[in-house]
Interface confidence: medium
């Protein structure tokens, strides 16, 4: 039975040209995290494997930095980066947990962070 929950940064916004940290946290389970995948709509951004470390997708090598922790830093933001991002936690023995973050990249200098929320 999957008892865990994914807490994410929820809906966030950032300025064009800036950077943003995508962060998820798995709680309420003792399952072992074996791998975390970061995806953007139909593309893979990066993988963090418990044994092997980080794999950054070649398409994003220049703009994605691993961390902090199991999170991901997205740099040199453009308006095209606006959209949904997913953290996929592979765990043993529970299985897979998925969290969703919506990022809006703004032209203006006003970028407020949304509230945190949870996805079971």
């Amino acid at each position: 039975m999957m008892t865990g929950t994914i807490e994410t940064t929820g809906n966030i916004s950032a300025e064009k040209g800036g950077s943003i940290i995508l962060q998820c946290h798995l709680s309420s389970t003792t399952a072992q995290v074996t791998q975390v995948n970061w995806e953007q709509q139909d593309q893979l951004l990066a993988i963090c494997n418990a044994d092997l470390g980080w794999h950054i997708s070649p398409s994003f090598k220049d703009r994605v930095a691993p961390g902090p922790g199991l999170g991901l830093t997205l740099q040199s933001l453009t308006v095209n980066d606006t959209g949904e991002y997913f953290c996929i936690y592979h765990t043993y023995p529970d299985g897979t947990y998925t969290g969703r973050i919506f990022l809006e990249v703004l032209e203006s200098s006003v970028a407020e962070h949304g509230a945190r929320f949870q996805i079971p």
């Epitope: 995806e39 139909d42 593309q43 893979l44 993988i47 494997n49 092997l52 070649p58 592979h90």
Partner: antibody, heavy 118, light 107 residues
Framework: QLQLQESGPGLVKPSETLSLTCTVS??????????WGWIRQPPGKGLEWIGY???????YYNPSLKSRVTISVDTSKNQFSLKLSSVTAADTAVYYC??????????WGQGNLVTVSS | EIVLTQSPGTLSLSPGERATLSCRAS???????LAWYQQKPGQAPRLLIY???SRATGIPDRFSGSGSGTDFTLTISRLEPEDFAVYYC????????FGQGTKLEIK
Amino acid sequence: QLQLQESGPGLVKPSETLSLTCTVSGGSISSSRYFWGWIRQPPGKGLEWIGYIYYRGSTYYNPSLKSRVTISVDTSKNQFSLKLSSVTAADTAVYYCASSSAWYFDYWGQGNLVTVSS
Amino acid sequence: EIVLTQSPGTLSLSPGERATLSCRASQSVSSSYLAWYQQKPGQAPRLLIYGASSRATGIPDRFSGSGSGTDFTLTISRLEPEDFAVYYCQQYGSLYTFGQGTKLEIK
């Protein structure tokens, strides 16, 4: 345990397009655990990575072959495919499909020998 | 592109002996990104070692991997008849490349 099986013609004419399909069993091709890749081996020679696809459709190809390669995935059939255009005799090889964890290739098909000849 | 050079090209040994195969990279490779495969005639390669030193599932403990940076080694502590095959190293940097292979043959 994953099992992979290549299928496709064993003979292709020069300048035509080589097409191969890999059927995955024992697991879902939609798993975010894996990349699905193609590797080839000319007779008596070493291994050359061709490219891979992620289940969401993003691809990455060997730069030396990129202009001629297309890899696609059909999640409904649990298959992924390779197309290599404008083939020459130098493309004669055993073509393997394989699953990749992103760092290494852990499960392989048995291989499909494709000969390019008129 | 990272080039992997394996040596020797052919290694002739007898069952029961120790085999040491070398893989040298043209530039530094993260240990996480180095793997070894065994290939027998007419068969697909089989993953032996990943992450430079971790044995894949079902691989006997006579196989071990070591090394870092540009120099990596596959060691077979005591050769069994079924170990005679071709061995390839492989790295993942921004793309996958394989070494040219070492043929391990019976002396």
